[in-house]
């Protein structure tokens, strides 16, 4: 099982010193986002139990294997559910925390039930503020069951659950009508998927026999043991205060483990930690009780004391759990609770042991799952142990499973049972990924996803020319890091492998697929310089360059120009195809604006030095506009305009242009040129008579500019209809502008 | 989907007797209080008894109790209403009615309501 | 036992009228115990309205339930056709007792 708890503080005077903290044991926990460790995520589960919306609340993360959730404000922010989920891929696992409230009008009995497929579950609601009304229970947030008042049996509410099936697993709830639902007494059922004692697919294999209140898992038949005890059965105690799968962590604060609520994976649940009891885990265990929540009974014989964390602690000359073997009988000494071995190895294990009279080689054997009794090679007899030595022949995967060291000497007999993992070692399942290349190196990505067992513990990266018969060449990289493979051939493709190993003899595992990655093309290395540029229009620029002479081919497939306009901070960038190309015309330009310019000589991907950089200025795109601009009706077909020339001119005006419109009109508008730059005023003739116009005027230098204000003005009447407006007599001769 | 099916109804003279079944499918029937609601031609809704889903405890009206009696079978998605010493007054239509409990929103408190119904059954007391 | 009178016992309106109509409790009723059902002649009640205010599945949006205490209404907004009918108030206190019932009749 991975190795993630979930602690939650359960001194509730004060809500905001509440927290709820995940920790995990596991290599690589929280790492990151990355493919060797998903970080670890601390939540409320609002999809069952709903509270009222309150501020969010405060996620810390000490390291990378512990995140603590905080900034509760009321009591009603702590009732429902929380998660945490640590562990990676197929090991991803949600620890589930059930919280209620101190002062619920019911509370649970026994708030985690963990039982077997098929059992009897009975959740138990223990009335604290009696209500005369219904009860209601509620499964997963649904609707479940009703139970009148009047059905309370010793002040409890009992939900009976015969013949519970897995997916009978899940939150339950007991709630008064009427009440609020943070009244409630919330449960969480977990139904293992065997019945009891058993695990695996179809429920066949037989569970290690899992002491002091450890829960087989029935997928992989190992003990989830409660906290504060460790080894492949929890038959070894942790020092007090200490927690985790190998009791590496320890509880917070002064008082160890009081007041602790410790959430461990399913089918384990929640309890409180070795030598403490009660709803809020603050009551030490009574004389005689030990263990997680008290639950265990220590019977210690042959003077044998007991300890509330631990259990018996023997006197000397006295072993076993009860205190009940004598140390005459033979007795396996520091086995480890679980090794791991690499697939297709060879291992060496040993097995010491101690008794009188004194073992002997022939009287140690190792027994396989599969039943194979593996006898030992050779024996180090010691004064005070003997350790047998076994040669196992090559694993396989169905080694994996629970071995037996046994001795057996006239005085008795003695085993241990052991976990031997065999991993598989990784096999990359895809090609590492090219990040950058330039000319003589490749930047690669070396994380992949890979089939059989983490953790990696190294990285190697082979690579040769394509279509070449060398040796490989290997390089040796930090898994979380990409690699630079450098001092390759420019323009040439190298076929690139990863290969991942994990710990121990035997963990590399086989090349992963090849792919092609191909060095960049040289860096073109000639600076070109700008020999002159000529304003062209107010958006309209001829460059011209030059590149200095060297011999041999021109290294390049083009050029590209840059303009940086400053004012708005935008590039302009103009690629000119040919390496012989010298000049360009950029155009679209923006009037008015002061450029800086450089070119450079591009090839294939890669840019040459720029060339030192000009800086031009484009002439305004035209004039600002007439002032004072003024109509008055000469006749029944003249309107006279009258104007002021415009201030701050960058020139000399080559024309102004009329724009005439009948008010309300829907016809385009007509533009009269005006070719006497000097004039202040013209005469529009060949209006309509008792005709209400329109005008405006603009200036032209380069470009045109901006329009003047717009004036209104009638012809007077009794006039013919005339042909349309004109401007002096010349206008006639030389058209209209439309 | 949800249905119950009322049955048993018919004539009988006072001082006799009746007894009424609902059968029930498309819901797990043993988790759901049951209802027998009665109405009386022209006349309003009378709630007459309810049951809990163990069937250990039963409620009355003052007008039925120590004459009728609600009772379930569970194994058959059955509900009950022997009727004994029966007078002209219980003459009704009969019907018997499923109470759901309702989060009448995300936090507040459960709230009770009689969601789906019989089509009923007549039970005519006449000599 | 608790009793629920409602009021008035019959309502003449018209299709697109606003419908108004009363329930009061003989002693204070939790609002999460008062339902509202509607009947139409020759069928089963349906549930319209429970924990005084909430609509069940289905119900249009133009009927509401309000009050606490003593005093509740159910309020149809706009009349529809459909919504002339026999509607009962109803408690799940002490005893699950219902109202007399008010006729919604087309004026």
């Known amino acids: 099982a991975v190795d993630l708890t979930l602690l939650a503080n359960l001194r509730l005077t004060d809500p905001q010193r509440f927290f709820l903290t995940c920790v995990s044991g596991e290599a690589g926990a929280g790492r990151g986002s990355d493919a060797w460790g998903p970080p670890l995520l601390l939540e409320k589960d609002d999809r069952i139990v709903r509270t009222p919306p309150g501020p969010p609340l405060r996620l810390a993360r000490n390291g990378s294997h512990q995140v603590t959730l905080r900034g509760f404000s009321k009591p009603s922010d702590l009732v429902g559910v929380f998660s945490c989920v640590g562990g990676a891929g197929a090991r991803r696992t949600r620890v589930i925390y059930v919280h209620n409230s101190p002062g619920a009008h019911l509370l649970p009995d026994k708030v985690t039930h963990t039982v077997n497929k098929g059992d009897t579950a009975v959740l138990s609601a223990r009335v604290h503020k009696e209500k005369q009304t219904d009860v209601i229970w509620k499964s997963n947030g649904s609707y479940f069951y009703t139970l009148d008042w009047h059905e309370a049996q010793d002040g409890r509410f009992l939900l009976q659950l015969p013949n519970v099936q897995p997916p009978s697993s899940g939150i339950y709830s007991a709630t008064y009508l009427e009440a609020s639902p943070l009244g409630s007494a919330f449960f969480r059922l977990i139904v293992r998927g065997c019945g009891a004692g058993r695990w695996g697919p179809g429920c066949t294999k037989e569970c290690p026999g899992c002491l002091h209140g450890g829960v087989c898992h029935d997928h992989d038949g190992e003990c989830v043991c409660p906290p504060g005890f460790t080894g492949t059965r929890c038959e070894q105690a942790c020092r007090e205060g200490r927690f985790g799968q190998s009791c590496q962590e320890q509880c917070p604060g002064i008082s160890g483990c009081r007041g602790l609520t410790f959430c461990l994976p399913d089918p384990y649940g929640c309890s409180c930690g070795s030598g403490w009891r009660g709803s809020q885990c603050q009551e030490a265990c009574a004389p005689g009780h030990f263990g997680a929540d008290c639950r265990l009974q220590c019977q210690c014989q042959n003077g044998g004391t007991c300890d509330r964390f631990s259990g018996c602690v023997c006197p000397s000359g006295w072993h076993g759990v009860h205190c009940e073997k004598s140390d005459r009988i033979p007795q396996i000494l520091n086995m480890a609770s679980e090794l791991e071995f690499n697939l297709e190895t060879m291992p060496r294990i040993n097995c010491a042991a101690a008794g009188n009279p004194f073992p002997v080689r022939g009287s140690i054997e190792l027994r396989k799952p599969d039943g194979t009794v593996l006898l030992s090679t050779k024996a180090i007899v010691e004064p005070e142990k003997t350790t047998a030595e076994f040669e196992v022949p090559r694993l396989v995967l169905a080694d994996s499973g629970f071995w037996e060291c046994r001795v057996s000497t006239s005085g008795g007999q003695d085993s241990r049972r052991f976990k031997v993992n065999v991993k598989v070692p990784p096999v990359p399942l895809a090609a590492p990924r090219l990040l950058t290349k330039q000319s003589r190196q490749l930047v690669v990505s070396p994380l992949v996803s890979f089939s059989g067992d983490g953790p990696i513990s190294t990285v190697r990266l082979h690579y040769r020319p394509q279509d070449s018969t060398m040796d490989w060449s290997t390089i040796v990289v930090d898994p979380s890091e990409n690699v630079t493979l450098m001092n390759l051939r420019p323009k040439t493709g190298y076929s690139v492998r990863v290969q991942l190993s994990r710990p121990g003899e035997g963990g590399e595992g086989a090349w992963g697929p090849p792919t092609l990655m191909t060095t960049d093309c040289p860096e073109p290395l000639l600076q070109p310089w700008l020999e002159g540029w000529h304003v062209e229009g107010t958006d309209r620029l001829r460059v011209s360059w030059s590149l200095p002479l060297v011999p041999g081919p021109l290294v390049g497939d083009g050029f590209l120009l840059r303009l940086w306009d400053g004012t708005r901070g935008q590039e302009r960038r103009e690629n000119v195809s040919s390496p012989q190309a010298r000049t360009a015309l950029l155009t679209g330009l923006t009037p008015g604006t002061h450029y800086q310019l450089d070119v450079q000589l591009y090839h294939c991907t890669l840019l040459g030095p720029a060339s030192p950089p000009a800086h031009v200025l484009l002439p305004p795109s035209g004039p600002p506009a007439p002032r004072h601009l003024h109509a008055q009706a000469l006749s029944d077909s003249e309107i006279q305009l009258t104007w002021k020339h415009p201030e701050a001119l960058p020139g000399p005006i080559s024309k102004y242009v009329v724009e005439v419109q009948v008010a309300g009109g829907a016809g385009d508008p007509l533009w009269i040129d005006v070719d006497r730059p000097e004039e202040t005023s013209t005469i529009i003739r060949g209006l309509n008579a008792s005709t209400r116009y329109l005008f405006r005027m603009r200036a032209s230098i380069q470009g045109l500019g901006d329009w003047s204000n717009t004036v209104e003005e009638s012809t007077l009447g009794n006039g013919l209809q005339a042909e349309g407006p004109v401007q002096e007599s010349r206008a006639a001769e030389e058209g209209l502008d439309q | 989907e949800v249905q119950l099916l009322e049955s048993g109804g018919g004539l009988v003279q006072p001082g006799g007797s009746l007894r009424l079944s609902c059968a029930a499918s498309g819901f797990t029937f043993s988790g759901y209080v049951m209802f027998w609601v009665r109405q009386a031609p022209g006349k309003g809704l009378e709630w007459v008894s309810g049951i809990y889903p163990s069937g250990g405890w039963t409620v009355y009206a003052d007008s039925v109790k120590g004459r009728f009696t609600i009772s379930r079978d569970n194994s058959k998605n059955t509900l009950y209403l022997q009727m004994n010493s029966l007078r002209a007054e219980d003459t009704a239509v009969y019907y018997c009615?499923?109470?759901?409990?309702?989060?009448?929103?995300?936090?507040?408190?459960?709230?009770?309501?009689?969601?789906?119904w019989g089509q009923g059954t007549l039970v005519t007391v006449s000599s | 036992d608790i009793q629920m009178t409602q009021s008035p016992g019959t309502l003449s309106l018209s299709p697109g009228e606003r419908a108004t109509l009363s329930c009061r409790a003989s002693?204070?009723?939790?609002?999460?115990?008062l339902a509202w059902y509607q009947q139409k002649p020759g069928q089963a009640p349906r549930l319209l309205i429970y924990?005084?205010?909430s609509r069940a599945t289905g119900i249009p949006d133009r009927f509401s339930g309000s009050g606490s205490g003593t005093d509740f209404t159910l309020t149809i907004s706009r009349l529809e056709p459909e919504d002339f009918a026999v509607y009962y108030c109803q408690q799940y206190g002490s005893s699950r007792t219902f109202g007399q019932g008010t006729n919604v009749e087309i004026k």
């Open positions: 924990g005084a205010s």
């Open positions: 002693q204070s009723v939790s609002s999460s115990y």
């Open positions: 009615a499923r109470v759901n409990y309702y989060d009448s929103s995300g936090y507040g408190p459960i709230a009770p309501g009689l969601d789906y």
